[in-house]
């Protein structure tokens, strides 16, 4: 028995942030979950992770260096990444494994989500026009 | 209280195979994963790899992916290391330990240890 | 594969003497490095995780610092039960692996 999983299939970070929502066909309240988010069309970069459990607060956190964070809805985790760079464009799958009660579940692979990351725009603000160009 | 009780010492020939139990009580089996750590004599602890017991997942260190045999019987909440194809280099004390499977990256409760003797 | 080189591999130090041990990771493991004590014929014990977090019941004197590639364990007044072996281990990603270990003895 596999867990079904929503997701966007393309967000645009524009200021280097995004908020990915994850939405499952299971509901979390009480049960003890890690919910995880994969870089890359292998999955081979493990974003983020949130861990949650009935008796104490969800905990985020990032081994390899990214700024996120994560909200719990009864069926669903949002991911909140910030500091994205250009370069960190990429396919991005949620992952959600229950590991208490038994039996342990996970999901079906989902579709993932394209997030385009576009580079923080430096134009001139109209009331403080910047040097003019040739 | 939250244990690891491994089983007893064992002498074996070399060529010979091994296999090592770890019965875990006091926590929920399934939020950690086991780890397997060795120590030879006077020397450092060298991590041989891990088992998940919900989906028993693996995870080898290179150097025993060939030989180290990682299972788990949730049944009984024990977990266990084969070894096979024994050296005298494998003389080691070999130890499980736990790491949780939403916060994994320490080892916080260890076993008692095996001592596994490789001689002819 | 990510190696963990600590230093010294031993020291002498007396009751009472403040105590630097060092690891270097070969890349960058941003805070994911714990520090065991380990006496002879017993298991390790956890004493710091995640670089700088004490564990449960270890005492106050032991303290953790660094981030990236470069770690410090310190024992800020050595007592007689603190002689004994100390390692330092990545749990950033797999496989996971230790230090060479640092003997504490009894100067």
């Known amino acids: 028995n596999k867990i079904l999983v929503k997701q966007s299939p393309m967000l645009v970070a524009y200021d280097n942030a995004v908020n990915l929502s994850c939405k499952y066909s299971y509901n979390l309240f009480s049960r003890e979950f890690r919910a995880s988010l994969h870089k890359g069309l292998d999955s081979a970069v493990e974003v983020c992770v949130v861990y949650g459990n009935y008796s104490q607060q969800l905990q985020v956190y990032s081994k390899t260096g990214f700024n996120c964070d994560g909200k719990l809805g009864n069926e669903s985790v949002t991911f909140y990444l910030q500091n994205l760079y250009v370069n960190q464009t990429d396919i991005y799958f949620c992952k959600i494994e229950v590991m208490y009660p038994p039996p342990y579940l996970d999901n079906e692979k989902s579709n993932g989500t394209i997030i385009h990351v576009k580079g923080k725009h430096l134009c001139p603000s109209p009331l403080f026009p910047g040097p003019s160009k040739p | 209280q939250v244990q690891l009780v491994q089983s007893g010492a064992e002498v074996k020939k070399p060529g010979a195979s091994v296999k090592v139990s770890c019965k875990a009580s006091g926590y929920t089996f399934t939020s950690y994963y086991i780890h397997w750590v060795r120590q030879a004599p006077g020397q450092g602890l060298e991590w041989i790899g891990c088992i998940y017991p919900g989906n028993v997942n693996t995870n080898y260190n290179e150097k025993f992916k060939d030989r180290a045999t990682l299972t788990v019987d949730t049944s009984i909440s024990t977990a266990y290391m084969e070894l096979s194809r024994l050296r005298s280099d494998d003389t080691a004390v070999y130890f499980c330990?736990?790491?949780?499977?939403?916060?994994?990256?320490?080892?916080?409760?260890w076993g008692q240890g095996t001592t596994v003797t490789v001689s002819s | 594969d990510i190696q963990m080189t600590q230093s010294p591999s031993s020291l002498s130090a007396s009751v009472g003497d403040r105590v630097t041990i060092t690891c270097h990771a070969s890349q960058n493991i941003y805070v994911w490095l714990n520090w065991y004590q380990q006496k002879p014929g017993k298991a390790p014990k956890l004493l710091i995780y995640?670089?700088?977090n004490l564990h449960t019941g270890v005492p106050s004197r032991f303290s953790g610092s660094g981030s990236g590639t470069d770690f410090t364990l310190t024992i800020s007044s050595l007592q007689p039960e603190d002689f004994a072996t100390y390692y330092c281990q990545q749990g950033q990603t797999y496989p996971y692996c230790f230090g060479g270990g640092t003997k504490v003895e009894i100067k």
């Open positions: 330990t736990r790491s949780h499977y939403g916060l994994d990256w320490n080892f916080d409760v």
């Open positions: 995640k670089a700088s």
